[in-house]
């Protein structure tokens, strides 16, 4: 089946001056033999012999897509008129990186638009970009095979102090965002409640400013700010956080009632609803999914349900009245 129906009318291609009927006749009453498809491609309407003027359509194997004009036409001289067509990979292969780097998520193939994050062991940062996106058949930005981990200057500076602080004699003082943050540190996506805006900030600057008591700054996620579910949840989480009774420092982040600080990654991870402890007086009246009935949930349950991206409408704070 071809979408280019051939009614035998002579046609002129964009780049040709001659009509097909003007082409010199060559004895080839047998038509054209099967053409050779491009690498990773195949002939859709496959047969041994094609009539003059007949089209064949080039298709690509799964994971590849056609680039160029995908129809060949059988000419009277028994040859094929074929434009430049190739089958290009529509997925990216897992990049080969140095052993010290961890790829998340770890899979063999990645679809266009999917991203990976490169991370290093504790106390080290990626010496370059940490987030890469599959575009076409390659990674953007390109992944250098010499990419490695370097000692995190934040770790060196802080000594025995907390993140955002540095050792000054025997005591810990806040780092200066201007003086102590000239070195490279990984990007973080940060939300400023004052300006009600989010932006990408170097980790060092964010931690230094947070240490200097800038309570309006909230960590959203590691890596530069990019539209998507992670950012969406980060913003929603920030709104919910004002009512949280638990505020536990965890790496760059602060964990709330519905989260646990992962010891191995120093990241806040959402609990699952059944892990929520009943305690706490932060209650909400909600409607779940498409249900019409109201339910009273605690802040932990609300946080875990929203984190899991399940549909839920918060009707009002406090117990449901009915």
């Amino acid at each position: 089946f071809s979408i280019m129906e051939n009614n035998g009318q002579p046609c002129i291609n964009d780049d040709e001056e001659m009509k097909e009927v003007d082409l010199p006749e060559i004895e080839a009453d047998s038509g054209c033999p099967q053409p050779v498809p491009p690498e990773n491609g195949f002939i859709r309407n496959e047969k041994q012999l094609y009539l003059v003027g007949e089209d064949v359509e080039i298709s690509c194997l799964t994971g590849f897509e056609t680039v160029g004009y995908q129809y060949f036409r059988c000419l009277p001289d028994g040859t094929w008129r074929q434009g430049d067509v190739e089958c290009q990979r529509t997925e990216c292969i897992k990049p080969v990186v140095q052993e010290v780097l961890t790829i998340t998520p770890f899979q063999r193939l990645y679809r266009i638009g999917e991203s990976i994050e490169l991370t290093c062991p504790k106390g080290f940062v990626v010496a370059g970009p940490s987030r890469y996106t599959c575009q076409g058949n390659s990674w953007t930005p390109p992944i250098s095979n010499s990419l490695t981990c370097e000692k995190d200057t934040l770790t060196k500076l802080k000594g025995h102090c907390q993140l955002g602080q540095k050792q000054s004699g025997s005591e810990c003082i806040c780092m200066s965002p201007e003086e102590d943050c000239s070195h490279h540190s990984e990007d973080l996506c940060v939300f400023d409640t004052d300006s009600n805006d989010y932006f990408t900030s170097p980790a060092c600057k964010f931690l230094a400013e947070k240490c200097l008591n800038n309570q309006q700054l909230h960590f959203l996620h590691i890596g530069s700010c990019q539209d998507g579910r992670q950012l969406e949840w980060g913003l929603e989480r920030t709104r919910l956080s004002s009512n949280s009774t638990k505020k536990e420092s965890c790496g760059y982040d602060t964990c709330y009632d519905w989260e646990k600080c992962s010891a191995s990654t120093s990241k806040c991870v959402c609990l699952l609803p059944p892990q929520c402890f009943k305690g706490g007086n932060q209650l909400y009246c909600v409607k779940m999914g498409s249900s019409t009935s109201e339910k009273t949930l605690n802040i932990c349950e609300v946080g875990t349900i929203r984190c899991a991206n399940r549909k839920m409408e918060i009707l009002h704070p406090g117990k449901c009245l009915a």
Epitope: R229, Q230, P274
Partner: antibody, heavy 118, light 112 residues
Amino acid sequence: EVQLVESDGGLVQPGGSLKLSCAASGFTFSDYYMAWVRQGPTKGLEWVATINYDGSSTYYRESVKGRFTISRDNAKNTLYLQMNSLRAEDTAVYYCSRPSTEALFAYWGHGTLVTVSS
Amino acid sequence: DVVLTQTPSTLSVTPGQPVSISCRSSQSLLNDVGNTYLYWYLQKPGQSPQLLIYLVSDLGSGVPNRFSGSGSGTDFTLKISGVEAEDVGVYYCMQASHAPYTFGAGTRLEIK
């Protein structure tokens, strides 16, 4: 110390019914969701059902929906699993389980064997 | 349902030897906010399962640090740096990233 003790299971005919209970101690029972997990000879470990603090929300695996009912009595610190229309594939050791902030199934009872056979 | 495939199905090792158990998922366990709900349990002979590792790599309470977990996406590994006699039993991975929660078929560890 958290303790979960399941009642004795037993041999039931296909199509028959059985009610399991789990006595909880060592923690405030009404503060936690509770669950049943089973371990069959062929299917391995399977989550069966979960119930919230007061029993107002229950969740089941697809294969037991409409046949099994999870319930609780907070005054008695007891979790139940009513199993109706039992099938041979329901043969398993049934465990009562409690979550923690570490995992959904952090604490387990010793288990009770339910055999469905004619 | 998400299928978790564990390899090998049986392991026979001498005490002190390191051990590695693989758990492969039929779909990614990384959710859209970056969380991965992958757990490891050990069921010793005649006992109930006990939690070893939660959230891929965090050690359960009271679990010896010879146990460690790693991985992301669809590939996960449990390692024991030096097996001890008390480590015998069946090791299970479990996922809670997708409903219903599912377990692997288990890897039996025996001591030579």
